[in-house]
């Protein structure tokens, strides 16, 4: 059962796993949620009745029954982890804590104009977990405006104390706001020879990389595959760090793979969700339960629904035994990973999908006017919406993309003549415009947010957000697309598609069926040559064939330029402008979404 509210002046008795320090009960709840075993917690707030050394302690707890006895205690705040909840979870914490000094290893000290600048510095520093900033009112003159970047083994402070005229806060890496490079490559036959901060067992290098990503100290990893010569090290995932933040030495070794933490791209690729099945593989760990199950998929479901289950091994039924049901072993460990991985015993293993809700929904794999385009199939572009105006009569106005359960990203120029959001309707999960009848359900628009600097599409800033009146329930036919990672600025996308119901030629009409066209990206230098009378800025991105023939056109505006990278679709562009449609040497010009990620997050995460 999901319990989100906090219990004031209440302490849970027993069940202690570990104690950390957090600046608030709210953040203690987040830490508990992300801990592999924590189900409940007790936080101690600052209070004259409490020993100051106990202030800000966050005791993480576990219980076989998923609850613990409650005791009244002033200044104690208790609650449950969000593991039991089905809603999306985020570790993003933008709060600034006034008059609190969060202790850790102070590894960098510099002058900063503001706490915000200090937080940005922390976010863009590979080692930084949190910071403390001495304001200009700080008593000690030489410490004023000093920004201390800090890290710890756990990612949380080692202690928190009251200190006047300082502010503290966390890195915003988990808010997708880091400019650090996102290196997704896994390097075969490579060992990174740097200090290990931890080691876990993993079935493959991808899981190892994801574990590295949500380990607070891991910057890169080395994984020894099951073919690794040294038997005791097979399936070993070594979590590593270095002072520079990069591997100091790369050693060529067969059957080893290495890679980097994905912390700078974690909002746009799955890092918690290990959804694969591992055949002929047994995961060892503490046994939670053994249940009969029809298949390994059913076993995974059972594990996902059991809040304490972290991973499982399924042994298929022998011939006609037990009505064809096999045994499903639900398991757990102290760190969420198997204690040992064995091969050749016929088991099928995997992980709970409960952690998938910690990943952005947009990373979920989907079922596999556009000039020169072809018709799409249902569910092919589940983030594509059709934006309608009802004034003076109802008609398709523009395309748009679902980027959150209450947010549509589109183009600013779509709102010419729109006097109020009341006249707008957003339809999702639509393939044919003819599906839209009077009684077809739609999302009303609560607010239109147009970029302050938008004047005309050709000058840039052609971007707008629609805040919906109600939330979108994600299904196979309506789900979000990932925003590109700021750390992905240098990625060369090769699989890009433009979609929409727009014209198929310059003088035409809105199409009934959603059209799609695969279109290559064009460099900004090349694009500038094609548009000499315009300024193609870095905030624009171009796509088109030199010979023309395929392009977006009138009515496609605001829709997505979607690019698939590492099996995840990213919203790389918003259809904006171009000379004519599909003309030779006149590429389409799109709003370059990566350059607006900060703006999007600022607007969508505003309190």
């Amino acid at each position: 059962e999901c319990v989100t509210q906090l219990l004031k002046d209440t302490c849970f008795e027993g069940g202690d796993i570990t104690t950390v320090f957090t600046p608030s009960a709210k953040y203690c709840q987040v830490v508990c949620t992300y801990h592999p075993r924590c189900l409940l917690f007790t936080f101690t707030a600052e209070s004259p009745s409490e020993d100051p050394t106990r202030w800000f302690t966050c005791v993480l707890k576990d219980s076989v029954t998923e609850t613990l006895p409650r005791v009244n205690r002033t200044a104690a705040i208790s609650g449950y982890s969000f593991k039991q909840c089905s809603h999306q979870i985020s570790a993003c914490n933008k709060d600034i804590y006034v008059d609190l000094d969060m202790k850790g290893i102070n590894y960098n000290s510099s002058v900063a104009k503001s706490a915000q600048e200090c937080q940005e510095r922390c976010t863009d520093d590979v080692h930084c977990h949190f910071f403390t900033y001495a304001t200009r009112q700080f008593p000690s003159l030489e410490h004023r405006n000093i920004c201390l970047l800090k890290h710890t083994q756990t990612g949380t402070p080692t202690r928190i104390t009251k200190l006047d005229k300082v502010v503290s806060g966390f890195s915003l890496k988990s808010c997708a706001l880091s400019n650090l490079a996102c290196i997704r490559d896994i390097f075969p036959n490579t060992v990174f020879a740097d200090s290990n901060i931890d080691s876990v067992m993993a079935p493959d290098a991808f899981v190892c990389g994801r574990i590295c990503t949500h380990h607070p100290g891991c910057l890169f990893f080395t994984f020894f595959s099951q073919e690794w010569p040294k038997e005791s090290q097979r399936n070993l995932c070594l979590l590593k760090t270095s002072e520079s933040g990069l591997p100091s030495t790369r050693i060529k070794k067969s059957k080893a793979l290495s890679g980097f933490s994905l912390q700078s791209c974690r909002h746009s690729i799955p890092v918690f969700c290990h959804s694969s099945f591992y055949h002929d593989t047994d995961f060892l760990g503490e046994e939670l339960d053994i249940v009969a199950a029809k298949s390994h998929e059913a076993c995974q479901k059972l594990c996902t629904n059991a809040v304490r289950c972290q991973f499982f091994t399924y042994t298929p039924a022998q011939a006609s035994c037990n009505e064809g049901k096999g045994k499903c072993y639900l398991k757990l460990s102290s760190n969420g990973s198997p204690t040992k991985i064995l091969h050749g015993r016929g088991g099928i293993s995997g992980y709970t999908l409960r952690l998938c809700k910690m990943d952005n929904e947009c990373t979920t794999k989907i079922k596999p006017r556009i000039v020169g385009g072809t018709a799409s199939v249902r569910g092919e572009w589940p983030w594509q919406v059709t934006l309608h105006t009802t004034s003076p009569t109802q008609r398709h106005l523009c395309g748009g993309s679902i980027i959150g359960n209450q947010w549509i990203l589109t183009a600013a120029h779509c709102f010419y003549g729109v006097e109020s959001p009341k006249i707008l309707r957003v339809y999702s999960g639509i393939l044919n415009q003819s599906e839209i009848k009077e009684d077809t359900s739609f999302f009303g628009v609560q607010e239109i947010i147009i970029h302050d600097q938008y004047k005309m599409a050709e000058s840039g800033y052609d971007i707008a957000l629609l805040k919906l009146e109600t939330t979108v329930n994600y299904t196979d036919s309506q789900r979000p697309i990932c925003l590109p990672s700021k750390g992905d600025r240098n990625v060369i996308y090769t699989d890009c598609w433009v979609t929409g119901w727009g014209y198929r030629k310059l003088r035409d009409k809105i199409q009934n069926t959603l059209q799609k066209a695969k279109i290559p990206l064009v460099t900004n230098e090349e694009c500038q040559k094609r548009y000499r009378g315009h300024k193609i800025t870095h905030k624009m991105i171009c796509a088109g064939y030199r010979e023309g023939g395929k392009d977006a056109c009138k009515g496609d505006s605001g829709g997505p330029l979607s690019c698939k990278h590492n099996e995840v679709w990213h919203l790389v562009g918003i259809t904006s402008w171009g000379e004519g449609c599909a003309q030779r040497e006149r590429p389409g010009v799109y709003t370059n979404v990566v350059e607006y990620v900060d703006w999007i997050l600022e607007k969508t995460q505003a309190v």
Partner: antibody, heavy 118, light 112 residues
Framework: QVQLKESGPGLVQPSQTLSLTCTVS????????LHWIRQPPGKGLEWMGL???????SYNSRLKSRLSITRDTSKSQVFLKMSGLQTEDTATYYC????????????WGQGTLVTVSS | DVVLTQTPGSLSVTLGDPASMSCRSS???????????LEWYLQKSGQSPQLLIY???NRFSGVPDRFAGSGSGTDFTLKISRVEPEDLGVYYC?????????FGSGTKLEIN
Amino acid sequence: QVQLKESGPGLVQPSQTLSLTCTVSGFSLTSYHLHWIRQPPGKGLEWMGLMWRDGDTSYNSRLKSRLSITRDTSKSQVFLKMSGLQTEDTATYYCARGMTLATPFLYWGQGTLVTVSS
Amino acid sequence: DVVLTQTPGSLSVTLGDPASMSCRSSQSLESSDGNTYLEWYLQKSGQSPQLLIYGVSNRFSGVPDRFAGSGSGTDFTLKISRVEPEDLGVYYCFQATRDPFTFGSGTKLEIN
């Protein structure tokens, strides 16, 4: 509700500078674009310029050299200054607000008549 | 700058009859974003102008359906299917595709 009101001197000497104020209510100048438009007696409308909501300005190229549009967002006011006035600048001066984008003009002030005469 | 030429300068019609006026632009008003930023305004005697049509053919809310805008590129037309007494005044076309924006010279609609 949305209101725009132009104010300024009814009479200006030739060669002097005209200063007009458009005071708005019911919306913020940082959310909407504001235009100045004029109309000489018995003649047509002439678009003079606009204050974009981000603080940038655009001007009618014929008037650009003598025109300046500024604002004070805290007072919800946009100002028009035009130098070197001649008798042909005698007109009713309107301020107008766009919809979500710069145009179409959805709201207009009632206009203020400025006479250039010695 | 874009010059908008409106014809005729004045138009005398009988109430209940149709009326048609033209607005010709010195450059195409089709924007590269797919919109055509061409609008029609009516100014009645002693009043501020009021919006009738935006984007060539879209009637603003509350505008009677006897008003219809059409055209593309450089040639635009405003038609009134049956002129009513409240339709009298001066009609202006206006373009916001090219900066600086410009008004047409106006067409005065009078009663016969």
